[in-house]
Amino acid sequence: KESCDVQLYIKRQSYHSIFAGDPFKLECPVKYCAHRPQVTWCKLNGTTCVKLEGRHTSWKQEKNLSFFILHFEPVLPSDNGSYRCSANFLSAIIESHSTTLYVTDVKSASERPSKDEMASRPWLLYS
C-alpha cells in the first residue's frame, strides 16, 4: 500500500543558475493523497529559514503531482541564496531539502556563461 504521507520532491543539494532581470519559477513538487496541504516557501538566513510573505505564488496540477510555485518577476541579485518549501500536514511540518539559486547579475557579466562554466566556479562547486 502506498504511503499517504505528504512528500516534497526537491533534490538535496540541487541548484539553479539564473540571471538577474529574467523571470523565474521555483517549483516545489508536492505529493499528497486526499487534501492538499498548506505549503509555504522560506529563504535560509544562516540556520534560520525566514518565511517569504507577500510573494507571488501559485499552484500547478499535474497527473500525480502538484507544484507550489514561487514566482520571481524578475529575478533580483538579492534573490541569490537557498530556499526551502514546507508543508503543513496533520499539524506536522514537513520540510523539503533546500535548493540554491545562483544569480548572475547581467550588468557584471559580459555574456551569459554556459552550464559548464557555471559549474566551474569555485563558489558553486564547494558551496
Epitope: Q7, K11, R12, Q13, S14, H16, T47, D116
Partner: antibody, heavy 119, light 112 residues
C-alpha cells in the same frame, strides 16, 4: 530494479579524449543524481563529479575541472563522462553510479569501463 | 576537501568472528539538514563497488543484518558481527555531505 550498463573498454593515446556512456534502466533519471568515480589499477576510489539529469547541471572535483565533462540525455536515460588531454595516469576503471536525489534510498553502480592510456 | 581515513588498512578475521573497521573524517559530516551523509561500500574482488550502508547506519535492501554502522560527527564504524566467507572484500567509507565527495583509502578484509 535499477540497473546501469556502461560502454566497453577503450585504449587511447596520450593527449586524446575518451567518452564513456552509462545507460540507466528501472528509474526515471530526472529523480536521480548520476556520478562518476574512477579506480586506478590496485588503487582506491576517486570521485570525478556528478550531474543532475533534470537540469544538466554538473559539479566536478577540482582535480578534474576543465578536463572532465559530464552530460546526460534524459530521453535515452544515459549519462556520459568525457575526459580530455589523457595521460598514462588516467588509466583506470571508470564507474558510473546513480542514486535517489530525494532520500538517497538507492545507490547503484555500473559494471565499470576500463580506459587504458598508452602510446 | 574532507579527508577520510580508515583503520586498519587490512585485517584478517576467522569465520564467525567480529570485524570492526573505523573511519575518521577531517571535519564533521553532520549536514545542515541534521543528517550525516556517511556511506559504506563493499568491493569484492573483480566486482564493482556496492553500497552497504548509508546515513551512517541504514542498511541497503538485501544487505545481511550482520553488517551494521554507527558513529557521529567525525568518527564512524562498520561492524560485521559474524564474518562469512563471502565477506572477503575491500570496504570503503565515503562522505556525501560536502563537495567534492571523498573516499577512505579502503580496508581489505581477509579470512584467517
Amino acid at each position: 530494479q535499477v540497473q546501469l550498463v556502461q560502454s566497453g573498454a577503450e585504449v587511447k593515446k596520450p593527449g586524446s579524449s575518451v567518452k564513456v556512456s552509462c545507460k540507466a534502466s528501472g528509474v526515471n533519471i530526472k529523480d536521480t543524481y548520476m556520478y562518476w568515480v574512477r579506480q586506478a589499477p590496485g588503487q582506491g576510489l576517486e570521485w570525478i563529479g556528478r550531474i543532475d539529469p533534470a537540469n544538466g547541471y554538473a559539479r566536478y572535483a577540482q582535480k578534474f575541472q576543465g578536463r572532465a565533462t559530464i552530460t546526460a540525455d534524459e530521453s535515452t536515460s544515459t549519462a556520459y563522462m568525457e575526459l580530455s588531454s589523457l595521460r598514462s595516469e588516467d588509466t583506470a576503471v571508470y564507474y558510473c553510479a546513480v542514486y535517489d536525489g530525494y532520500y538517497e534510498s538507492f545507490d547503484v553502480w555500473g559494471q565499470g569501463t576500463l580506459v587504458t592510456v598508452s602510446s | 576537501d574532507i579527508v577520510m581515513t580508515q583503520s586498519p588498512d587490512s585485517l584478517a578475521v576467522s569465520l564467525g568472528e567480529r570485524a570492526t573497521i573505523n573511519c575518521k573524517s577531517s571535519q564533521s559530516l553532520l549536514d545542515s539538514d541534521g543528517k550525516t551523509y556517511l556511506n559504506w561500500l563493499q568491493q569484492k574482488p573483480g566486482q564493482s563497488p556496492k553500497r552497504l550502508i548509508y546515513l551512517v547506519s541504514k542498511l541497503d535492501s538485501g544487505v545481511p543484518d550482520r553488517f551494521s554502522g554507527s558513529g557521529s560527527g567525525t568518527d564512524f564504524t562498520l561492524t560485521i558481527s559474524s564474518v562469512q566467507a563471502e565477506d572477503l572484500a575491500v570496504y570503503y567509507c565515503w562522505q556525501g555531505t560536502l563537495f567534492p565527495r571523498t573516499f577512505g583509502q579502503g580496508t581489505k578484509l581477509e579470512i584467517k
